[in-house]
């Protein structure tokens, strides 16, 4: 059943999530720079084809309009969704040297947003099924591939970061 | 209430290995990340790696990324570090923390264990 | 790597009197989104470290209120308002903006 903005979400929890939702986006967009600078890859919407050959898939967040907002459905799909780009930044992982401590940061920013979004579905009793493994995740068969990869994950992560801010901005409201 | 116990004690020589275990109790094991930090007697806190458990993922201090091996076992909700070639200065207490974001981070830590290198 | 260095080393105080820790980070922990990822933990004496504040200013659940964190980007103090013999012990600065996480070399309390 749809639940508006003034459903049982404590601010402390909205502002916390605002918050990492921020950094996380700092860090992608820190990462799309490097590989910008030092690869030339600036532009994910060239490499749309290859995101579908390599496989790269998206995070829905089809429970989180504004208007007809599922809350148990939305935080579940942020969940998951948090929880996808776990494994895709992990498929990331040798990408260069360089670009390691912008990636490992990125990897546990992320995963401390799944723990905090998990913490209160947990606390509102409506936590998910714990996920057993990840699904199959993108296979690069060489260095270009992987950092091609790094652009279309990193797109696809601050797009969906966009919209988890705004449904969230939406349910901090008064 | 969240409780991390680690292993005892361990007497080691160089050129071994050690592998220290953390179990928790009190929360939701696979969704929180586990830390490892170290302190050599006298020392500061040094920072050697995390485990996500949820996917298995482990990402190490630089410093230590040929030696530690960070891991974790849902089922028994157990942490596990393991630190290979050892030296006389990994002498050291060598604790695991849960992680977490603002008022979460390492707002829970193990009793330690005192790991001796000595031949 | 984040370098992080605290003053003094090591501080003697007489009970019921101030105390102030400084700690300096060689980078800007302050982030983009308003948030400075700067941390105190005390370990007293035979004990793990426990959190005292997080995010430079924010005191930690069940701290006393004599504790304070403030600072800037790269220069933070935490500052006991009057200390009392329980407060003695190893005090840390560490950040959590990139990792490695990093510590400062800590400072030791000590009553007069």
């Known amino acids: 059943t749809p639940l508006g903005p003034a459903s049982s979400l404590p601010q402390s929890f909205l502002l916390k999530c605002l918050e990492q939702v921020r950094k996380i986006q700092g860090d992608g967009a820190a990462l799309q720079e490097k590989l910008c600078a030092t690869y030339k890859l600036c532009h994910p919407e060239e490499l749309v084809l290859l995101g579908h050959s390599l496989g790269i898939p998206w995070a829905p967040l089809s429970s989180c309009p504004s208007q007809a907002l599922q809350l148990a459905g939305c935080l579940s799909q942020l969940h998951s969704g948090l929880f996808l780009y776990q494994g895709l930044l992990q498929a990331l992982e040798g990408i260069s040297p360089e670009l390691g401590p912008t990636l490992d940061t990125l990897q546990l920013d992320v995963a401390d947003f799944a723990t905090t979004i998990w913490q209160q579905m947990e606390e509102l009793g409506m936590a998910p099924a714990l996920q057993p493994t990840q699904g199959a995740m993108p296979a690069f068969a060489s260095a270009f591939q992987r950092r091609a990869g790094g652009v279309l994950v990193a797109s696809h992560l601050q797009s969906f970061l966009e919209v988890s801010y705004r449904v969230l901005r939406h349910l901090a409201q008064p | 209430q969240v409780q991390l116990v680690q292993s005892g004690a361990e007497v080691k020589k160089p050129g071994a290995s050690v592998k220290v275990s953390c179990k928790a109790s009190?929360?939701?094991?696979?969704?929180?990340?586990m830390h490892w930090v170290r302190q050599a007697p006298g020392q500061g806190l040094e920072w050697m790696g995390y485990i996500n458990p949820s996917i298995g993922y482990a990402n190490y201090n630089q410093k230590f990324r040929d030696r530690v091996t960070i891991t974790a076992d849902t089922s028994t909700s157990t942490a596990y570090m393991e630190l290979s070639s050892l030296r006389s200065e990994d002498t050291a207490v060598y604790y695991c923390?849960?992680?977490?974001?603002?008022?979460?981070?390492?707002?829970?830590w193990g009793q330690g264990t005192l790991v001796t290198v000595s031949s | 790597d984040i370098v992080m260095t605290q003053s003094p080393l090591s501080l003697p105080v007489t009970p019921g009197e101030p105390a102030s820790i400084s700690c300096r980070s060689s980078?800007?922990?302050?982030?983009?989104?308003?948030?400075?990822?700067l941390y105190w933990y005390l370990q007293k004496p035979g004990q793990s470290p426990q959190l005292l504040i997080y995010?430079?200013?924010n005191l930690a659940s069940g701290v006393p209120d004599r504790f304070s964190g403030s600072g800037s980007g790269t220069d933070f103090t935490l500052k006991i308002s009057r200390v009392e013999a329980e407060d003695v012990g190893v005090y840390y600065c560490?950040?959590?903006?990139?990792?490695?996480?990093?510590f400062g070399q800590g400072t030791k309390l000590e009553i007069k």
């Open positions: 995010q430079m200013s």
């Open positions: 560490a950040q959590n903006l990139e990792l490695p996480y990093t």
């Open positions: 980078k800007s922990l302050l982030h983009s989104n308003g948030i400075t990822y």
């Open positions: 923390a849960r992680g977490g974001y603002g008022d979460s981070l390492f707002a829970y």
């Open positions: 009190g929360y939701t094991f696979p969704i929180y990340t």
